[in-house]
């Protein structure tokens, strides 16, 4: 093993980490779990503990980024450099960055969670054997109802374990049809559709009607994404494999390497490659986020690369399902932090539960009862010509959290985000929010749980704004944005989808700027944002101090309240009023005392 010069290390043992944003390659819960397990490798052999927090002053900030992403070490596109980490220390030191141009998996292909079947929601196992053939994506083979399924073990023929893959024929997400499956064909604007479509939408999300006639019933849902068959490269990147497809007159119901000399798997994205010539590469095994994270966290704790090829800290990625830590890794980390004080826990013994009823040879259909829980995240209804979102929710039945001193908004030093929603001021902090209406003797109401009202959101928000016309709520956290229309949500989406470059680490605020337009802020910069198109005008980039002279340059939140702009720094705000095109600071005050009218005791 090697350590950094001078045995660079953390000088406290309770290390905190913040997952600033996410990759879209894996479900959030899987990412959270991969990072937690990676930290657990190191805490199992040292006195270190790792606690997840939701603020940027964490010791280890974890970020997904592409190319230039805000440090001096740009990523390099797919493959090559997978991630990087800084050695222990303040600021960016200790942080770990992951290249989101990689396909992140658990090392064995895309992670596709299943529903129904007999595998209790286990993820697909790619490749898997069915009737002697190998499948690297979900398939409809062996079924007459067109539902895609997969084996959750390497061999369906011997193990009989399966589940259904995300499919619009099984369920839809969000929309206004309570998750009902698509109805094909369906009528939209007088035209017949026999597959999901993006027509009527500007955001590229695929949707369908859940009755035979959208024009009449206005019921719709969003089609689940199929990570297992979303192609890369070729001439159809981002589109789905179509199975079966015809290639050189022969039919293929799984990805194939036929016609290639390099063995790479590909598929057609229409039913006939011979006539349409549309194709892309099938997802590869991807890189294990768990293993790469474990290696990067080794760096973040003070370990340099090892010269032992079997060690986790060896500088080359190698997928393994065995215990990742080598004796050399353990020696290295203990050289820095010492051994774990108490005896190392023995792994629990587990028994594999047996299915209660013997499954049939071929996957059976899903139960008739659909799952009661709706997905919490997903896009809202298509704008303009397309289906509209459901009506906005009525009075919320938000849970009030048991009160403690910190739950009084007046005791909050710095709020994560503040926004005027409706005619009330909403103040967000660490998974909670308060509501405030101006008036003599009025006090903030709450706290309420963000998760109750907006379940898709993370605990830590950077900024929030409401677009008055559409009543859309925009929530920003790290490099991601969620857009709520009533109870339905679009997102999370990456900031690049709004036209903000990889150098924009977060959106720190927003102000109205004319009909359907906003100003988005990030640190010292701002952009004009078209709410309908959900896109910034890249030519509109400007420096904050040019447009708003006199406000601090390191504001952490910008919001609009009572037609004035507020720039927050620490516990203070700078209020800006606009008179005859001039923006002037007309007040500096405390958020708590001067806006929330808290008593100064």
């Amino acid at each position: 093993f090697q350590t950094f010069e001078g045995d660079l290390k953390w000088h406290h043992h309770n290390i905190t980490y913040w997952i600033q944003n996410y990759s879209e390659d894996l479900p959030r819960a899987v990412i959270d779990d991969a990072f937690a397990r990676a930290f657990a490798l190191w805490s199992a052999v040292t006195p270190l503990t790792f606690t997840r927090v939701y603020s940027r002053d964490a010791d280890i900030v974890i970020q997904f980024g592409v190319a230039e992403h805000g440090d001096g070490y740009p990523f390099d596109g797919k493959d090559g450099l997978l991630a990087h980490a800084f050695p222990p220390g303040p600021g960016i030191q200790g942080d770990a960055h992951f290249d989101d141009d990689e396909l992140w998996s658990l090392g064995k292909g895309v992670v596709v969670p299943t529903r129904f079947g007999n595998a209790d929601g286990a993820a697909c196992h790619f490749p898997f054997i069915f009737e002697g053939r190998s499948y690297s994506a979900c398939t409809t083979d062996g079924r007459s109802d067109g539902l895609p399924w997969c084996s959750t073990t390497a061999n369906y023929d011997t193990d009989d374990r399966f589940g259904f893959c995300p499919s619009e024929r099984l369920y839809t997400q969000d929309g206004n049809a309570d998750g009902k499956p698509c109805q094909f064909p369906f009528i939209f604007q007088g035209q017949s559709y026999s597959a999901c479509t993006t027509d009527g939408r500007s955001d590229g999300y695929r949707w369908c009607a859940t009755t035979a006639n959208y024009d009449r019933d206005k019921l719709f849902g969003f089609c689940p994404t199929r990570a297992d068959s979303t192609v890369m490269g070729g001439n159809s990147a981002g589109e789905l494999c179509v199975f079966p497809f015809t290639f050189l007159g022969k039919e293929y119901s799984t990805c194939t390497s036929e016609g290639r000399g390099d063995g790479r798997l590909w598929c057609a994205t229409t039913s006939n490659f011979d006539s349409d010539k549309k194709w892309g590469f099938c997802p590869d095994q991807g890189y294990s986020l768990f293993l790469v994270a474990a290696h990067e966290f080794g760096h973040a704790l003070g370990l340099d690369h090892s010269s032992v090829p079997e060690a986790l800290m060896y500088p080359m990625y190698r997928f393994t399902e065995g215990p990742p830590l080598h004796k050399d890794d353990v020696n290295g980390i203990r050289h820095l932090y010492g051994p774990r004080p108490e005896p190392e826990p023995r792994p629990p013994t587990t028994t594999t539960p047996q299915p209660t009823a013997p499954p049939t040879v071929c996957p059976t259909g899903p139960p008739t009862v659909h799952p009661s829980e709706r997905p919490t995240a997903g896009p809202t209804g298509p704008p303009s010509a397309g289906p509209t979102g459901p009506p906005t929710a009525g009075p919320s039945t938000a849970t009030t959290v048991p009160l403690s001193p910190v739950d009084d908004a007046c005791n909050v030093n710095i709020f994560d985000a503040i926004a005027e929603i409706g005619n009330q001021l909403y103040l967000f902090k660490d998974g909670k929010y308060w509501r405030f209406s101006e008036g003599r003797g009025s006090r903030p109401q709450g706290p309420f749980l963000i998760a109750d009202k907006w379940p898709a959101l993370p605990r830590k928000l950077d900024s929030v704004f409401e677009e008055r016309l559409s009543k859309k709520l925009f929530f920003f956290s790290g490099r991601q944005v969620w857009v709520y229309t009533g109870a339905s949500v679009l997102g999370p989406r990456r900031l690049d989808k709004l036209g903000l470059g990889a150098d924009v680490a977060q959106v720190t605020g927003a102000l109205r700027s004319g009909r359907g337009k906003m100003l988005l802020f990030s640190g010292r910069r701002l952009w004009r944002f078209d709410v309908k198109a959900q896109m910034v005008d890249p030519r509109s980039a400007s420096e904050v101090d040019r447009m708003f002279p006199g406000v601090p340059l390191d504001t952490h939140d910008v919001f609009q309240y009572r037609e004035k702009a507020y720039f927050c720094q620490d516990r203070f705000y700078w209020r800006v009023s606009s008179r005859s095109e001039l923006n002037q600071v007309d007040q500096v005050g405390y958020v708590t005392y001067d806006i929330l009218q808290c008593p100064e005791d």
Epitope: G72, F75, D79, G80, A83, H84, A85, G89
Partner: antibody, heavy 124, light 107 residues
Framework: EVQLLESGGGLVQPGGSLRLSCAAS???????DMWWVRQAPGKGLEWVS?????????FYADSVKGRFTISRDNSKNTLYLQMNSLRAEDTAVYYC?????????????????WGQGTLVTVSS | DIQMTQSPATLSLSPGERATLSCRAS??????LAWYQQKPGQAPRLLIY???YRATGIPARFSGSGSGTDFTLTISSLEPEDYAVYYC?????????FGQGTRLEIK
């Protein structure tokens, strides 16, 4: 002992081309990012280009983008800089330099070994 | 791009004296700063990396300090071989940039 040896410099007319090479020895070449840095006569240092260890990523200073191409042959432990459409302002001593850090550990900022430099003169 | 400003442009000191060279970044670069020494007709030589770590073979009279935007290279007692041009270089943000250099000359 680590050594970097540049070659390929010389006098060339504006609009012309030149290919610089840098032969490396004494370290595991394929593990390290490699850089070209130049210095105009009597002036300071200016980075030109970098290529990552795998050769999978290359980056260029705005002043040379679209005209220069960096490449490497890890089997030959050699770094290259193909310079096309040369201009008078490209006149400089060109150094190849080895990054002190490697791979995914991004702390040790600095170029710990430099070649002796090769002079490129662009003049008619 | 981040601008690196070195001061003074020229520093005239006698052998045995203490030399203090300054480098300022136009925005915070954490500790991602290196110092190089260059003598006439020679390639630059790495002295300090990550603001304060001495490179292999560099005498203890050379030390670096600072973080954020302000950095200092100190030569505690000048030797005749120390007279040269000194450059700072940042990698706190992309792309990397160099300072314009400080010439250290014999008084």
């Amino acid at each position: 002992e680590v050594q970097l040896l540049e070659s390929g410099g010389g006098l060339v007319q504006p609009g012309g081309s030149l290919r610089l090479s840098c032969a490396a020895s004494g370290f595991t070449f394929s593990w390290y990012d490699m850089w070209w840095v130049r210095q105009a006569p009597g002036k300071g240092l200016e980075w030109v280009s970098v290529i990552y260890s795998s050769g999978g990523a290359t980056f260029y200073a705005d002043s040379v983008k679209g005209r220069f191409t960096i490449s490497r042959d890890n089997s030959k432990n050699t770094l290259y800089l193909q310079m096309n459409s040369l201009r008078a302002e490209d006149t400089a001593v060109y150094y190849c330099a080895k990054d002190r850090a490697y791979g995914d550990y991004v702390g040790w900022n600095g170029f710990d070994y430099w070649g002796q430099g090769t002079l490129v003169t662009v003049s008619s | 791009d981040i601008q690196m400003t070195q001061s003074p442009a020229t520093l005239s000191l006698s052998p045995g004296e203490r030399a203090t060279l300054s480098c300022r970044a136009s925005q915070s670069i954490s500790s991602f700063l290196a110092w190089y020494q260059q003598k006439p007709g020679q390639a630059p030589r790495l002295l300090i990396y990550d603001a304060s770590y001495r490179a292999t073979g560099i005498p203890a009279r050379f030390s670096g300090s600072g973080s954020g935007t302000d950095f200092t290279l100190t030569i505690s007692s000048l030797e005749p071989e120390d007279y040269a041009v000194y450059y700072c270089q940042q990698r706190g943000n992309w792309p990397i940039t160099f300072g314009q250099g400080t010439r250290l000359e014999i008084k």
